[in-house]
């Protein structure tokens, strides 16, 4: 028998690589049974993940999985940084992993950069 | 069920390109990590790297980074790795494999491998 | 990178004995999300490596429960409590926590 328990399906240490000035949508997906969840996203500052309040969200419908969606309108490069998205489930919290966003500035790119690149420049995220 | 299936040229010339593909079946890639990784004759595995084909992000070996290149086909349900500047180092049998999802993240499907020479 | 260290380099034992191979990572492999992805692997000659064990101690499916996986941090373990003809194979250890993935250098078992 298949779980009825919520699950938020962000891939463990995924990235994304983006550029400053464009629309982007950072998806969580988010596997349920019956009720949705109330889902919110946060910004992870450090070890502490601070709530994103204000934003722009949607959800999108699929067959077998729903996504909430966290919309950039667009990409700044304080957007730079890693983001959780999260459940509330029977009173309980659940978690996903966190995904990175690495902004380029496009003002400050030259030419733009390979998506290992960016991911093998993590203090990136610090700047 | 899950298949993953490496294929390519078993002969390589040396200072040439290295070419596989690895055709998957029973899953979609865009679900998941497809990784490389080689073992020279009577030798240890050597992870080569892997991408994430949802978006093309790639993480490579420090070791072999200057040299190889993981792309994806999402509407093949396939992956590619070249690599670049070969030497009779790099003969090897290549894998693909799966990194499953939540909750494990962990390599749980292998393709056969394919043995790849280089040699003149 | 972290280096993942595998002992023995081989082992030789009779049937029904039990055989112990140790991983030692060069740092810990506890990830920020609580788990630890270690992983044990077992290979077979002219065979791709099958997973046997995954986070640290979870037996995949079909895999005997004479395996066992323990440990923390950076030590880690697996057991096989009665060694059968069928477990000749390399075993390595393998981390999935910090990039770039490494193996261990792979421990040989063998029958006496």
């Known amino acids: 028998k298949e779980s009825c328990d919520v699950q938020l399906y962000i891939k463990r240490q995924s990235y994304h690589s983006i550029f400053a000035g464009d629309p982007f949508k950072l998806e969580c997906p988010v596997k349920y049974c019956a009720h949705r969840p109330q889902v919110t996203w946060c910004k992870l500052n450090g070890t502490t993940c601070v709530k994103l309040e204000g934003r722009h969200t949607s959800w999108k419908q699929e067959k077998n999985l729903s996504f909430f969606i966290l919309h950039f309108e667009p990409v700044l490069p304080s957007d730079n940084g890693s983001y959780r998205c999260s459940a509330n489930f029977l009173s309980a919290i659940i978690e996903s992993h966190s995904t990175t966003l690495y902004v380029t500035d496009v003002k400050s790119a030259s030419e733009r950069p390979s998506k290992d690149e960016m991911a093998s420049r993590p203090w990136l995220l610090y700047s | 069920q899950v298949q993953l299936q490496e294929s390519g040229p078993g002969l390589v010339k040396p200072s040439g390109t290295l070419s596989l593909t690895c055709a998957d079946s029973g899953f979609s890639i865009s679900d998941t990590y497809i990784h490389w990784v080689r073992q020279p004759p009577g030798k240890g595995l050597e992870w080569i790297g892997r991408?994430?084909?949802?978006?093309?992000?790639?993480r490579y070996n420090p070791s072999l980074k200057s040299r190889v290149t993981i792309s994806s086909d999402k509407s093949k349900n396939q992956a590619s790795l070249k690599l670049s500047s070969v030497t009779a180092a790099d003969t090897a049998v290549y894998y693909c494999?799966?990194?499953?999802?939540?909750?494990?993240?962990?390599?749980?499907?292998w393709g056969q491998g394919t043995t790849v020479t280089v040699s003149s | 990178d972290i280096v993942m260290t595998q002992s023995p380099d081989s082992l030789a034992l009779s049937l029904g004995e039990r055989a112990t191979i140790n991983c030692k990572s060069s740092q810990s492999l506890l990830d920020v999300d609580g788990k630890t992805y270690l992983n044990w692997f077992q290979q077979k000659p002219g065979q791709p490596p099958k997973r046997l064990i995954y986070?640290?101690?979870k037996l995949d499916s079909g895999v005997p429960d004479r395996f066992s996986g323990s440990g923390s941090g950076t030590d880690f373990t697996l057991t096989i409590s009665s060694v059968q003809a069928e477990d000749v194979a390399v075993y390595y250890c393998w981390q999935g926590t910090h990039f770039p993935r490494t193996f261990g250098q792979g421990t040989k078992l063998e029958i006496k």
């Open positions: 494999a799966r990194e499953d999802g939540y909750p494990y993240y962990t390599l749980d499907a």
């Open positions: 991408i994430d084909p949802a978006n093309g992000f790639t």
């Open positions: 986070l640290v101690s």
